[in-house]
C-alpha cells in the first residue's frame, strides 16, 4: 500500500512539476523591468524566452517575437534548449509512468516490468527537473550579469533587445515558477525511484507440496526462497533440494495479495 501511495504521489508531484515547467517556458515574464530607479514609469517592459512585451499604463500590451534565430544570444538558445529537453523528457516520463502505475492493470504485465518502468520514469523526471532548474539558473545568472551592464545601444544577453541606460531587468515570475516546478519534478522523480524498490516482485513463501517423479521421499523445507532484491532483478530462485521437484518459478503463478490495491 505504501509503495502504491509513494508511486501515485510521485506521479502527481511530477505531473504538477512538468505542467509548471511548460507554463514557465511559455511565460513572457522571465525578466521584468527593474523599477528601483524609476518607480513611476508609465511603460513597463518584460521579456520571455520567445518574445518581449511592453505594457503601457493605459492598459495596452504589445508583444514582439524574437523572429531571428541566429541573432539571439547563445545563452538564451541554451536556456530554450534546456527547457524543451526538460519538457520532452518529462512528457515521456509521464507517459511511461502512467503504464507503470500499480493501480492500473494492463494485460498480464508483471510487477518486474512495472518496476523497470517506474525506475525509468523516475530517472526521466529527475533529469527533466534538473534541466528546468539548470535552464532557469542560467537565465538568472545572465540577468545578474547584465544588471549592471545595461548600456545604451548595446546588445545584451536579453533576447538581443537594444537597451537604453535607464532600463535594467530583474527576475520575473517565470523564474520562480521554473525553480519550483523543476524542484517538484525532481522530487517526483525521486519518489518514483523509491517506489520502484518496493515494486519488484516479492516471492511469497507458498507452502506448496512438491512431488518427486520417482516416488522417493521428498525433503520439505518451508521458507527456503530468498526474496528478490528489487530494481527489476529477475534472478531465478534456487532449488533447495535435489530431484525432480520444480522450483516455484516454474509453477503456474497466481495473483498474490500485493497485486491489487
Amino acid at each position: 500500500m505504501a509503495v502504491t501511495a509513494c508511486q501515485g504521489l510521485g506521479f502527481v508531484v511530477s505531473l504538477i512539476g512538468i505542467a509548471g515547467i511548460i507554463a514557465a517556458t511559455c511565460m513572457d515574464q522571465w525578466s521584468t523591468q527593474d523599477l528601483y530607479n524609476n518607480p513611476v514609469t508609465a511603460v513597463f517592459n518584460y521579456q520571455g524566452l520567445w518574445r518581449s512585451c511592453v505594457r503601457e499604463s493605459s492598459g495596452f500590451t504589445e508583444c514582439r517575437g524574437y523572429f531571428t534565430l541566429l541573432g539571439l544570444p547563445a545563452m538564451l538558445q541554451a536556456v530554450r534548449a534546456l527547457m524543451i529537453v526538460g519538457i520532452v523528457l518529462g512528457a515521456i516520463g509521464l507517459l511511461v509512468s502512467i503504464f507503470a502505475l500499480k493501480c492500473i492493470r494492463i494485460g498480464s504485465m508483471e510487477d518486474s516490468a512495472k518496476a523497470n518502468m517506474t525506475l525509468t520514469s523516475g530517472i526521466m523526471f529527475i533529469v527533466s527537473g534538473l534541466c528546468a532548474i539548470a535552464g532557469v539558473s542560467v537565465f538568472a545568472n545572465m540577468l545578474v550579469t547584465n544588471f549592471w551592464m545595461s548600456t545604451a545601444n548595446m546588445y545584451t544577453g536579453m533576447g538581443g533587445m537594444v537597451q537604453t541606460v535607464q532600463t535594467r531587468y530583474t527576475f520575473g515570475a517565470a523564474l520562480f515558477v521554473g525553480w519550483v516546478a523543476g524542484g517538484l519534478t525532481l522530487i517526483g522523480g525521486v519518489m518514483m525511484c523509491i517506489a520502484c524498490r518496493g515494486l519488484a516482485p516479492e516471492e511469497t513463501n507458498y507452502k506448496a507440496v512438491s512431488y518427486h517423479a520417482s516416488g522417493h521421499s521428498v525433503a520439505y523445507k518451508p521458507g527456503g526462497f530468498k526474496a528478490s532484491t528489487g530494481f527489476g532483478s529477475n534472478t531465478k530462485n534456487k532449488k533447495i533440494y535435489d530431484g525432480g521437484a520444480r522450483t516455484e518459478d516454474e509453477v503456474q503463478s497466481y495473483p498474490s495479495k500485493h497485486d491489487y490495491v
Epitope: A42, N45, S58, G59, T167
Partner: antibody, heavy 117, light 113 residues
C-alpha cells in the same frame, strides 16, 4: 461613440474643496484610464493625475497631498477631488481617456472653475 | 519630473508655408522594450479642448491630415506641418507619456501673418 462630460460647481471659495464628476460613455472604465488635465486662463496645459482601468492612480507630484481621483464603474463616472483650494487653482478642468502610447485620445469639453471669495 | 521645453513659443506663418516646431525633454523618452518614443503632440484651438495629433512621437492619430509629421528620438522631437492651412492656427503642445507625472510643454502658438 466615445464621449466624456465634466460637471463642476463653477465657483468655489478659497480653502474649500473642489469636486468634479466626469461621466463617460462609449468605453469601459475597467479597460481604460481617465486623466485629469487643467488649464488656467490664457496658460498652458497641466496634467493633474490619472485613474487606470485596474483602479490604480498616479498624481502630479505637486498635488499629491491635495488631490484624490476615484471612480464608480457602475455609473461610468470618474471623480476628482482637490482640497484646500487657492486662487491659482482657477482653471478649466478637463477629463480625457487614455489610449495607445498613454496618449489622451478623447477629451471632454471641460468645466470652468473659479476660486474666489 | 521630466521637464518639456518647447520652442519657439510662437510662430507667425503664411498659408502654404512649411513649419517646424521643437520639443525637448530633460530625460530620454525612448523605451528600450519596443524602441518607441513616448512623446505625444496635441493641437488646441481657441475655446476647444486639445486634440490628439501624434503619439509614439511619429504615429498619426486616425483622421489627422498627413501634412502633420512627428519625428525625433530620445530627447529631441519635432512637429512639422508641411503646408500650413488656416485651420491649423492653434497652440501645439507636446507631452511626456513615458514617466509620471505626464508633463506638458508650455506650447507653441501658431499664428497667421
Amino acid at each position: 461613440q466615445v464621449q466624456l462630460k465634466e460637471s463642476g460647481p463653477g465657483l468655489v471659495a478659497p480653502s474649500q474643496s473642489l469636486s468634479i464628476t466626469c461621466t463617460v460613455s462609449g468605453f469601459s472604465l475597467t479597460s481604460y484610464g481617465v486623466s485629469w488635465v487643467r488649464q488656467p486662463p490664457g496658460k498652458g496645459l497641466e496634467w493633474l493625475g490619472v485613474i487606470w482601468g485596474d483602479g490604480s492612480t498616479n498624481y502630479h507630484s505637486t498635488l499629491i497631498s491635495r488631490l484624490r481621483i476615484s471612480k464608480d464603474k457602475s455609473k461610468s463616472q470618474v471623480f476628482l477631488k482637490l482640497n484646500s483650494l487657492q486662487t491659482d487653482d482657477t482653471a478649466t478642468y478637463y477629463c480625457a481617456k487614455a489610449g495607445r502610447g498613454n496618449a489622451l485620445d478623447y477629451w471632454g469639453q471641460g468645466t470652468s472653475v473659479t476660486v474666489s471669495s | 519630473d521630466i521637464v518639456m521645453t518647447q520652442s519657439p513659443s510662437s510662430l507667425t506663418v503664411t498659408a502654404g508655408e512649411k513649419v517646424t516646431m521643437s520639443c525637448k525633454s530633460s530625460q530620454s523618452l525612448l523605451n528600450s522594450g519596443n524602441q518607441k518614443n513616448y512623446l505625444t503632440w496635441y493641437q488646441q484651438k481657441p475655446g476647444q479642448p486639445p486634440k490628439l495629433l501624434i503619439y509614439w512621437a511619429s504615429t498619426r492619430e486616425s483622421g489627422v491630415p498627413d501634412r502633420f509629421t512627428g519625428s525625433g528620438s530620445g530627447t529631441d522631437f519635432t512637429l512639422t506641418i508641411s503646408s500650413v492651412q488656416a485651420e491649423d492656427l492653434a497652440v501645439y503642445y507636446c507631452q511626456n507619456d513615458y514617466s509620471f507625472p505626464l508633463t506638458f510643454g508650455a506650447g507653441t502658438k501658431l499664428e497667421l501673418k
